[in-house]
């Protein structure tokens, strides 16, 4: 039975040209996390494999940095980065848990700076 829950940063906003940390946390389960995938729509951004570490997709290598922890840092944000991001936790024996984050990249300084995981 899947007892775990995923907490995410929820809906966040950031300024164009800036950086943001996407963060998820899996709790309430003793399942072993074998891999975490970060995806945007159907595009794989990066994976963090429990045994082999991080792998960043080549097309995002210049703008994506691993961490902190199992999170992902997006840099040099553009308006095109606006959209849904998913953290997919592959666990054993529970199976797959998915969290959703919506990022809005704003043109001007109207982006909120209060988001807990945002980089100033």
């Amino acid at each position: 039975m899947m007892t775990g829950t995923i907490e995410t940063t929820g809906n966040i906003s950031a300024e164009k040209g800036g950086s943001i940390i996407l963060q998820c946390h899996l709790s309430s389960t003793t399942a072993q996390v074998t891999q975490v995938n970060w995806e945007q729509q159907d595009q794989l951004l990066a994976i963090c494999n429990a045994d082999l570490g991080w792998h960043i997709s080549p097309s995002f290598k210049d703008r994506v940095a691993p961490g902190p922890g199992l999170g992902l840092t997006l840099q040099s944000l553009t308006v095109n980065d606006t959209g849904e991001y998913f953290c997919i936790y592959h666990t054993y024996p529970d199976g797959t848990y998915t969290g959703r984050i919506f990022l809005e990249v704003l043109e001007s300084s109207v982006a909120e700076h209060g988001a807990r995981f945002q980089i100033p």
């Epitope: 072993q32 074998t34 995938n37 994976i47 494999n49 082999l52 991080w54 080549p58 199976g95």
Partner: antibody, heavy 122, light 107 residues
């Protein structure tokens, strides 16, 4: 098309080391992990370990820990498996095999090399 | 480590026969099971992933089923090119482990 071409057969003495190479082509080398699997004569398949060609990180089966080293050369799209302190029980065909999908890394192998026979005999 | 047990270890069958091979995992692996076919002197070939998903180019006479701990590979009508050894493999967690193999021989 995807191809994994392994080095030729080797005959080694007990206590020696062997290094088997596996040259990959037909896909982006750093986008897929690589497994090593061996098969003793008339026996089943035995997983030895896996390497990430992009990072060079490895995970070895406990049985081979301390005796096996997996490395890669991204400039030639080649992975290597070195096994040391050889004994007669290490006589086997050694296969490199490409991981099926980075989204589920390390789960299964879809393309295999032709195999390299390593014979350990005094 | 997860142990994989295959049965039978060998089976004699004729062309046109239905052949069933079973694989049992020592603990639940959901649907994370693969089947490989290996012919003498050749490398294994991936037939089925995710317990029942046929790989591209694999004939439809091959089918896989099961989840949890018990899995089955079925060849609905055995063809001459199907005489080989078949291995199951758990694909849920490292280290990868294989079943001992089932040799399908000509009766």
């Amino acid at each position: 098309q995807v191809q994994l071409v392994q080095s030729g057969a080797e005959v080694k003495k007990p206590g020696a080391s062997v290094k088997v190479s596996c040259k990959a082509s037909g896909y982006t080398f750093t986008e897929y992990y690589m497994h090593w699997v061996r098969q003793a004569p008339g026996q089943g398949l035995e997983w030895m370990g896996i390497i990430s060609p992009s990072a060079g990180s490895t995970k070895y089966a406990q049985k081979f820990q301390g005796r096996v080293t997996m490395t890669r050369d991204t400039s030639t799209s080649t992975v290597y498996m070195e096994l040391s302190s050889l004994r007669s029980e290490d006589t086997a065909v050694y296969y490199c095999a490409r991981d099926h999908d980075i989204r589920l890394a390390g789960r299964l192998a879809d393309y295999w090399g032709q195999g390299t026979l390593v014979t350990v005999s005094s | 480590d997860i142990q994989m047990t295959q049965s039978p270890s060998s089976v004699s069958a004729s062309v046109g026969d239905r052949v069933t091979i079973t694989c049992r995992a020592s603990q639940g692996i959901s649907s994370w099971l693969a089947w490989y076919q290996q012919k003498p002197g050749k490398a294994p070939k991936l037939l089925i992933s995710a317990a029942s998903s046929l790989q591209s180019g694999v004939p439809s006479r091959f089918s896989g089923s099961g989840s949890g701990t018990d899995f089955t590979l079925t060849i609905s009508s055995l063809q001459p090119e199907d005489f080989a050894t078949y291995y199951c493999q758990q694909a849920v967690i490292l280290p990868i482990t294989f079943g001992g193999g089932t040799k399908v021989e000509i009766k």
